[in-house]
Interface confidence: medium
């Protein structure tokens, strides 16, 4: 742990580690019964993670603020960094125990050591994120999270260089979601699909999360998304609380980040 150059270090907030990854239903959070969670993992060539596998992943930085099914009907979630809104201020596996009612609805924690790894935590001042396999088409059943963590006081300017995801009403099939926060729970900015380049986005703080998800059928060309650091000195006049100036989307300052 600790700060270095104003950045909180350690590979926290990974969404996939040691073959363990978090899955939620396409309909959203906490929608999977035990049988459905098991089926989701198996469909992708994996299985429900054991408590030990989840703890091993947590030890190398796997942190998700969502309870999910594990093997043998257990429910819990891994916390690396304690926070007031997640994990009751504790670290470790927040364990709900083995559930008697297997029809309860939670997310899922899957284990698949052969799953394609993508995403991660990035502290560089600039970088380009690409969909897995770009410039080739991405695969079905992908889920990737890119977490950007810059120095306190800096902002993130996100721009879309290439963008071609499957078209589906409301982007229910394949999509990229952007969050103006450190996770995929708070600060939702938008969900994007299709082949139009979304407008640039400038964060309100020093963190941002990008999530890419593809479903089980039909793929497309993929994307390249670039971010650069906006230093406090060059923030220009961002008094405009909302909306769009040119092709840049300035986000209202609703979220404070450490």
């Amino acid at each position: 742990w600790g700060f270095k150059n104003g950045i909180f270090h350690n590979s926290i907030w990974l969404e996939q580690a040691a073959g363990v990854y978090h899955r939620e239903a396409r309909a959203g959070r906490y929608k999977l019964t035990y049988a459905e969670a098991k089926a989701v993992c198996e469909f992708e060539g994996g299985r429900l993670a054991t408590y030990k596998q989840l703890e091993a992943a947590r030890k190398i930085g796997f942190h998700v603020c969502a309870a999910g099914w594990m093997a043998k009907g257990r429910v819990g979630y891994p916390i690396v960094k304690p926070g007031p809104n997640c994990g009751f201020g504790k670290t470790g596996i927040i364990d709900y125990g083995i559930r008697l009612n297997r029809s309860e609805r939670w997310d899922a924690y899957c284990y698949n050591p052969h799953a394609k790894e993508c995403g991660g935590v990035f502290t560089d001042p600039k970088r380009i994120f690409k969909s897995p396999g770009f410039p080739n088409e991405y695969d079905d059943n992908q889920v990737c999270y890119w977490h950007i963590r810059l120095k306190y006081g800096q902002r993130i300017h996100l721009s879309f260089l290439d963008f071609d995801l499957e078209h589906d009403p409301g982007c229910l099939a394949d999509y990229v979601e952007i969050y103006d926060s450190y996770d995929d729970v708070h600060g939702f900015v938008g969900r994007y699909c299709g082949d139009e380049l979304p407008e640039d986005i400038i964060s309100t703080g020093n963190v941002m999360t990008l999530k890419f998800l593809s479903d089980a059928s039909v793929t497309a060309g993929g994307f390249q998304i670039k971010y650069v650091t906006v230093d406090p000195a060059s923030k220009s006049s961002q008094a405009k609380n909302t909306s769009t100036t040119g092709n840049k989307k300035f986000l209202p300052g609703r979220f404070s980040h450490l």
Partner: antibody, heavy 124, light 106 residues
Framework: EVKLVESGGGLVQPGGSLSLSCAAS????????MSWVRQPPGKALEWLGF??????????EYSASVKGRFTISRDNSQSILYLQMNALRAEDSATYYC???????????????WGTGTTVTVSS | QIVLTQSPAIMSASPGEKVTMTCSAS?????MHWYQQKSGTSPKRWIY???KLASGVPARFSGSGSGTSYSLTISSMEAEDAATYYC?????????FGSGTELEIK
């Protein structure tokens, strides 16, 4: 001419079931997402769900108000769209329209062709 | 879900008069679509992608707006324009319709 014609409406008791059909003609049915929309008497339109086209395996999505009670399916050999309605309630009384979903670039989906509608009344 | 509020609920206009109706979204949406429905008939696509007229729609109709505020305008009201107009979004799920603006001819 592109045409959608619904049938199967009528009077049904609360808790009962009904199946609506929508016969499509004038276009390649398998190439399109198809949807159901309803309109209670004197009220606004409400989207119920849609079913995807062949490339997406004909998977369906539903609105929260009907999920678990209504099922959308399609017979592609006959170009017919179905809406199976179970556990019907008084508030399900409405004119039911099938509509073709048209896509012309992200994120622009809209209902470009509408059927004539069929009326469902749920009452004891 | 995004709630679309149309105003006014009912309005009347004389032939030749300019008419504007609005559709306000509870959250920002990318585009708005509009449908025309005459009494006892099914809706018809009317304006899509905020401002594009569907085929067969007279040029006196126009659409505009962005974010949470959209409008449909008729530059010169004609008797055949009397109908109910519904706005609709699909920027986020589920797709939603407005409550409608009923336009009468004076």
């Amino acid at each position: 001419e592109v045409k959608l014609v619904e049938s199967g409406g009528g009077l049904v008791q609360p808790g009962g079931s009904l199946s609506l059909s929508c016969a499509a003609s004038g276009f390649t049915f398998t190439d399109y997402y198809m949807s159901w929309v309803r309109q209670p008497p004197g009220k606004a339109l409400e989207w119920l769900g849609f079913i995807r086209h062949k490339a997406k395996g004909y998977t369906a999505e539903y609105s929260a108000s009907v999920k678990g009670r209504f099922t959308i399916s399609r017979d592609n050999s006959q170009s017919i769209l179905y809406l199976q309605m179970n556990a019907l309630r008084a508030e399900d009384s409405a004119t039911y329209y099938c509509a073709r979903l048209y896509y012309y670039g992200s994120p622009h989906w809209y209902f470009d062709v509408w059927g004539t509608g069929t009326t469902v009344t749920v009452s004891s | 879900q995004i709630v679309l509020t149309q105003s006014p609920a009912i309005m009347s206009a004389s032939p030749g008069e300019k008419v504007t109706m609005t559709c306000s979204a509870s959250s920002s949406v990318s585009y708005m679509h509009w449908y025309q429905q005459k009494s006892g008939t099914s809706p018809k696509r009317w304006i899509y992608d905020t401002s594009k007229l569907a085929s067969g729609v007279p040029a006196r109709f126009s659409g505009s707006g962005s974010g949470t505020s959209y409008s449909l305008t008729i530059s010169s009201m004609e008797a055949e324009d009397a109908a109910t107009y519904y706005c609709q979004q699909w920027s986020s799920n589920p797709p939603t319709f407005g409550s409608g603006t009923e336009l009468e001819i004076k």
